[in-house]
Every structure is written in C-alpha cells, then in structure tokens.
C-alpha cells in the first residue's frame, strides 16, 4: 500500500517551488493538461549555455513525512537531447541531480539551507533513458522517463526535495512522493493494523476481531516488510467466541442466528439448538431449556435438555414374615436421560392408627436410594404394621425440577406377631426306642401359646419321607418308635393366634443301646 505525501498531478494551484539563484534561465513553472485533460503543473529548465559552475536549483515545499522512515520519489520527466539543440555548448547535460534536506519544521528560506550538497543530502544523479529530439519548427518527440528514487532513512518531522540542473534542457512533468505501508489486514480472525515499516521487517502484534478470542499459544504476530507487503507466515490467530462463528473468509465473527448456538470458542459453526431447548436471541453460546426441561450441572452446554422421569410402574410386593421384596417396572418416560435411579420413601402405621416416617430399624437392600435395578428387599418389618412405600424414579435433573416428584405407591400390612422360635430343648428321658423332651415356654407377644409342633428325623436320613411331626399342647413331648442307639435331629415351633412361629435350632439327641446305660447318660 502506498501513502501519498505529495503528488503534483493532484495539485490544482500553483506549486510555487523555490528556485535558486534568481537569474535568467532558471526553472519555471508551467501548467498543462495530462492524458485525462486534467490541469497539471510542470517545471522546465533549459539553460544549455550557462556559465561554468552555474547550477539551477529547484526545491519543493516542506513535506511532512508522517512517520515514514523511507520515502519514495517517482519522477516523470522529459530530457532534450543535447545534439538537437543548436545553441547547446559543451556545458549541455542530459542528467540532473536529486537531493533532500530534513528539518523539523518549514524553516527553509530563499537562501537557506545553503544550496549545496551538505547540508543537502544527495539521493542520485538521474540520467534520461529516453531523450527527446527537437527539429526546428517541429514538435519535440520522445518518451517520458519514469524514475523512482528512495530517500532515507528519515528522522525529522519533514523534508524538502531539491533538483539541481547543471545544463540540461528538461521538463519535470510530475513528482509523486509516497511511502509504503502494510495495509490493515484481517486474517484468521486477527486484525493487523496499518503499519509503516521502520526497518527491513517489523513484527506487528495482531488483535482479535470483534467477538473473537485469542487461540491458545503465542499471541498472533505478522511481519511488515519494508516494501509494504506482509511477510507470508502462518498466523496463530484468534477464534470466534462462544455464540459466534467465522464468516466472510475468516475475517469476521458472526453471531449465531436465533435457534442456533455455539458453546465453545474455536472453529466450528453454529449448530441448531438441541432437543427441548431454544435461543430467542442472536449470539447464543447456550440454548435455554424449555419450561420443565433442564440440564444437569455436569451436562455439556450443548447437551439436549431433559426432564425428570415419570413414576415407576407396576410395583409388586412379596411379604415374607418381617421381610418384604418389592420390584417394579421402569417409568414410561425416562426424561431423555440414561442416569435413571430409584428411591423409596416409607411410612409406617401402628395397629392403633398413628403413622410416622419409618424408623431406623428397617434395612433396605441394596439401599433406600440410588437404586440402579428396579427392586429392593426391606427387612425388619414389624408385625401388624401397615407400611406405605412410595417408589420414585430419579435422574440427573430431578433435583432441578420444582413441584412434587411422581411416585408409585404400595401398601403392605404385616401379619400379627407369631411366637418366637423355641430353643433350649432338653432331653428329660431317653430309652432305646424313645426320647422325652422339654423346653421353655416362649413369650408370645400376641396372646398365649396354643400348642407346639415337633419336627424330627433320624440323622443322615434326609428327604421328606423321613421327617415326622408331633403336636403337643404342653411344653414337652415324648418321641416313640425310635431306633436303638440312633441319632435324631429335633426342632420345635410354637403356635399362637397369629400362627406358627419359626422352628428353633436343630437339637441333636440319641436313643440308648440299653435301659441302664440310657438313664446314666441322661442323668450325666
């Protein structure tokens, strides 16, 4: 990119550059028309018979350098061939010299700085590539010369350009003073500012475009070369912020349209809102959940919105004394999530009718909550109590929902309490064919013991056919018809109005081989 400091082709008024010395044959300003018939200014000089050592100087106005370190001067000029000038002496030249002088303000006058090399800095002696020939009475013919010179390095606020003629017949048709700069550039969503190169290459820090954020890694930079071109090199750039996507050839970040979102910064485009969510504004990084739908804290921002599950279905209960096995079917609606668990709430009602949350004597296997499988075993139920179990299904967003959690209830009433197991069986008398047994009366909570059932079988004789039962209303019994010298396993259970209690522990007893021995053994 070129930034013009001076272009005589664009000047509409007299240039009025300074000439030195004030003598005849000096540079003179002319006006004319360029190829587009626009008014332009030129300078001519043609003192081919000048005195030796006499130079004609022409100096531009003061040109602020505007931060440029190197300035380029493009000269368009024509040069008359010395041979075609009848009056030309040996002092006729076909070259001219270009100088510049730096200053911090427009301080030059008609006489200062001194019109010579040092203080003026010589740029170059310019020779014409194309010479114009002039025939008497005919128009001069010849090509225009174009020469670009480089001035600098410059350090002061501005400068003057000066032309020294020492015997040429020439016309300075135009002067274009400019400097080169790297144009503002946007690449990879990174904007690099317009930069005037101060050296061969200058590193330039980039900044992210609006709605973009720096990518990880070193901050983006690009090199501006002295020729005003950006050096080609990969740019670790920026990426569009959440809610924005790259557009217009990676030069802009465009807000996600309504109904779309982009959750993270980086590459990628806006996506339609996931299930059960919406975005009513542009530039959404996340879509809002519909009423009744939620995202768990651990859900990604781009995850669909989900809802708590419906209640479990078809709870089936199997009561076994003080134990209860509950199982159920999964809810019809999972809420769109995989992390389904179950939990139980429990209330117990006493026989008298007062109800309260279940006490700590109940145990749940595997537990009362966070159940992954649709079943539980409840132990420690108290007899003659009514239990209400509410089975709820939960998922990762249940805690976010307001309002009651749907549940499936089941009511279970336990039987009244049966007598406890009979233990401490004693053998009171033993013979080769019989055993007399006694035991302590168990404390039955729901009324007296009505009777007992004795269950026995010979040790080693397993199977239902070998088991015998005996009922007795007393807390003793005599087992007859037993084998001599045999071992027997005996269990006793008590019956009350609530029914039979459990059999006690098996008691090991043995019949006698003969009468006298048996009595001794038992007494011992």
């Amino acid at each position: 990119l070129e930034e013009t400091l001076l272009n005589t082709k664009l000047e509409t008024a007299d240039l009025k550059w300074v000439t030195f010395p004030q003598v005849d044959g000096q540079w003179e300003e002319l006006s004319g028309l360029d190829e587009e018939q626009h008014s332009v200014r030129t300078y001519e000089v043609c003192d081919v018979q000048r005195a030796p050592g006499q130079a004609h100087w022409l100096r531009t106005g003061w040109v602020p350098r505007r931060g440029a370190v190197h300035v380029y001067a493009t000269l368009r000029f024509t040069m008359l061939e010395c041979l075609s000038l009848p009056r030309a002496g040996r002092s006729c030249k076909e070259t001219f010299t270009v100088f510049y002088y730096e200053s911090d303000a427009d301080t030059a006058t008609a006489l200062t700085p001194a019109w010579m090399e040092n203080p003026y800095i010589k740029v170059d002696t310019v020779a014409a590539e194309h010479l114009t020939r002039k025939r008497p009475g005919a128009e001069a013919t010849g090509k225009v010369n174009v020469k670009t010179l480089r001035l600098g390095p410059l350090s002061k606020a501005g400068f003057y350009l000066a032309f020294q003629d020492q015997g040429a017949c020439m016309a300075l048709l135009s002067l274009h003073l400019f400097y080169k700069k790297c144009a503002q550039l946007t690449v990879n969503l990174t904007r690099f500012p317009e930069t005037v190169p101060r050296e061969l290459v200058v590193p330039v820090a980039g900044s992210c475009v609006v709605d973009a954020v720096p990518a990880p890694g070193p901050s983006p930079s690009l090199y501006c070369r002295e020729d005003g071109q950006w050096a080609e090199q990969p740019v670790t750039g920026c990426s569009c912020a959440p809610g924005f996507e790259a557009a217009e050839g990676n030069t802009k970040c465009r807000a996600c349209a309504q109904g779309t979102f982009k959750p993270l910064s980086g590459e990628g485009s806006c996506q339609p809102c996931p299930a059960n969510s919406h975005s009513n504004t542009i530039g959404s990084a996340v879509c809002q959940c519909r009423v009744g739908y939620f995202r768990a804290r651990t859900d990604p921002r781009g995850a669909p919105c989900t809802t708590p599950p419906s209640a479990p279905r078809s709870v089936v209960s199997r009561l076994n004394g003080s134990s209860l096995h509950l199982e159920w079917s999964a809810p019809l609606e999972s809420g769109g999530r995989e992390d389904l668990t179950y939990a139980l709430r429990c209330r117990e009602c006493r026989p008298g009718g007062s109800c309260a949350p279940c006490g700590g004597d109940l145990t749940f296997d595997p537990g009362p909550r966070d159940l992954v499988e649709p079943w539980v075993v409840v132990r420690g139920l108290r007899p003659d109590f009514t239990y209400t179990f509410e089975v709820t299904a939960l998922n990762g967003v249940s805690s976010l929902a307001t309002g009651p959690v749907p549940f499936e209830p089941v009511n279970v009433t336990t039987d009244r309490e049966v007598p406890p197991a009979v233990s401490d069986i004693r053998v009171t008398r033993s013979s080769p064919s019989s055993l007399s047994l006694a035991w302590a009366v168990p404390r039955a909570p729901s009324g007296a013991v009505l009777d007992y059932e004795v269950k026995y079988h010979e040790k080693g004789a397993e199977g239902p056919s070998s088991v015998r039962f005996l009922k007795t209303s007393e807390n003793r019994a005599e087992l007859r018809g037993l084998k001599r010298g045999a071992s027997y396993l005996v269990q006793v259970r008590a019956r009350s109005e609530a029914g039979y209690g459990p059999f006690g522990q098996e008691h090991h007893s043995q019949t006698q081989l003969d009468e006298s021995e048996g009595w001794r053994e038992q007494l011992a």
Epitope: E29, S31, G32, A140
Partner: antibody, heavy 126, light 108 residues
Framework: QVQLVESGGGLVQPGGSLRLSCAAS????????MSWVRQAPGKGLEWVSN????????HYADSVKGRFTISRDNSKNTLYLQMNSLRAEDTAVYYC???????????????????WGQGTLVTVSS | DIELTQPPSVSVAPGQTARISCSGD??????VHWYQQKPGQAPVLVIY???KRPSGIPERFSGSNSGNTATLTISGTQAEDEADYYC???????????FGGGTKLTVL
C-alpha cells in the same frame, strides 16, 4: 518579427454574430497556447477564452460560455473567436494574446501573457 | 475563484518609488504577473512569476508576493511609466485567468 494582428471587429446589433481573427507570425504558432482578452471602454482587462496548442482543450469565462467559441487553424497560424448572441455588454476591444511558451513541450504553457495584439474593437449596439 | 483587488489610482513624484498593490485570499500561494497598458495601446508584460522581469523591461520594475498581497514596485519612477497597471493570476484548477481591476499610476 514576432507579432499578433487581430481583425474582424466592427459594429453589430444585439443578438448578432461576429468572427474575430488573429494572425500570428514570427514564432512557432502550433506550439503556443492562445487566449482572447477584452477591455470594455474605460474599464479593466477581462480574460475571455483559452485554447491549447493542439485545440485539445478550450476554456471560457462564465460571461461568454455557450455563446463564444475559440478555435485555431495551425496551418494558417490563425486564432479565431466566433461570437454569437452578442449583447451590449460584449462591447470592448478584443485582444489576442499568447501564453508563455514551453521550450519544447506544447502540452504546457506558462500562466502569463507574454505577447499581445493591438486589439480590434467590437461594438454591439442597435 | 480568486478575486484580485487593486487601488484605482496611485500618484508618485518623478524619481520616487511607486508601489501598486494587488490583494486576494492567500495570493502569496499563487504566481502574480503584472502588465502595463498605456492609453490606446495593448498591454505589455512587465513582471511575471511574482518577481521576474522579461527582457527589455527596465530594472526599476520589480515585484514581490507574500501573504495576501502582491506588490509592483517602480523605483525612480519616470514620466513614461505613467500608465494603467494590471495584476493577473491563474484561477485554480480551471485554466481561467483572473485580472485585477487595474491601477492608474500618475507621475506628478
């Protein structure tokens, strides 16, 4: 001898037309930009029109634009001013003038008039 | 376009210095040319490019231009210098030429 000689002036009625001529001699006419300048009786000088050496461009004062036409015939070394729709305020001495010439480039000219004719009187009256 | 203003008349005793001014906005940024016109004659260029003198013009004629004013100076004025003097400049961009109203110089 370097000179410019105007002719064609005279008395003309308002709305009438007149054509002035300016014969050039003693210099390379086809390299010169030429102009007409007029001077009303007892008044100052007023520039009227310019023409480039090759007739590629003409310029006019606002007061005559659309009514006057400047032209030249380089083969005859002659400059012309065709005046139509003449008005009383056009009454003046009309001078033909040469603009300062370039050494060798007829596309350019200096901004002063370095050679004048003796003038020709145009009277617009009924 | 630029407007050039001259005093209608200036008087000077023979041998004295006559100064004729020509003013206009930022005139110093333009080149000013001066013409002498004697009664019944065509104008003659006496100063061009602010201060240059054409060949044949006496050295007593000089010119300057800065700020808003250009000045034609005739030092050691002679009776033959009595004439009307006109300043002229180039109208920016349009190739239109602009003249001042003229100043009658009387040599007393």
């Amino acid at each position: 001898q370097v000179q410019l000689v105007e002719s064609g002036g005279g008395l003309v009625q308002p709305g009438g037309s007149l054509r002035l001529s300016c014969a050039a001699s003693g210099f390379t006419f086809n390299n010169a930009w030429m102009s007409w300048v007029r001077q009303a009786p007892g008044k100052g000088l007023e520039w009227v029109s310019n023409i480039t050496s090759s007739s590629s461009m003409t310029h006019y004062a606002d007061s005559v634009k659309g009514r006057f036409t400047i032209s030249r015939d380089n083969s005859k070394n002659t400059l012309y001013l065709q005046m139509n729709s003449l008005r009383a305020e056009d009454t003046a001495v009309y001078y033909c003038a040469r603009k300062g010439m370039s050494f060798y480039n007829n596309k350019y000219a200096k901004s002063m008039f370095d050679l004048w004719g003796q003038g020709t009187l145009v009277t617009v009256s009924s | 376009d630029i407007e050039l203003t001259q005093p209608p008349s200036v008087s000077v005793a023979p041998g004295q210095t006559a100064r004729i001014s020509c003013s206009g906005d930022n005139l110093g940024k333009k080149y000013v040319h001066w013409y002498q016109q004697k009664p019944g004659q065509a104008p003659v260029l006496v100063i061009y490019y602010d201060s240059k003198r054409p060949s044949g013009i006496p050295e007593r004629f000089s010119g300057s231009n800065s700020g808003n004013t250009a000045t034609l100076t005739i030092s050691g004025t002679q009776a033959e210098d009595e004439a009307d003097y006109y300043c002229q400049a180039w109208g920016a961009g349009s190739h239109q030429m602009v003249f001042g109203g003229g100043t009658k110089l009387t040599v007393l």
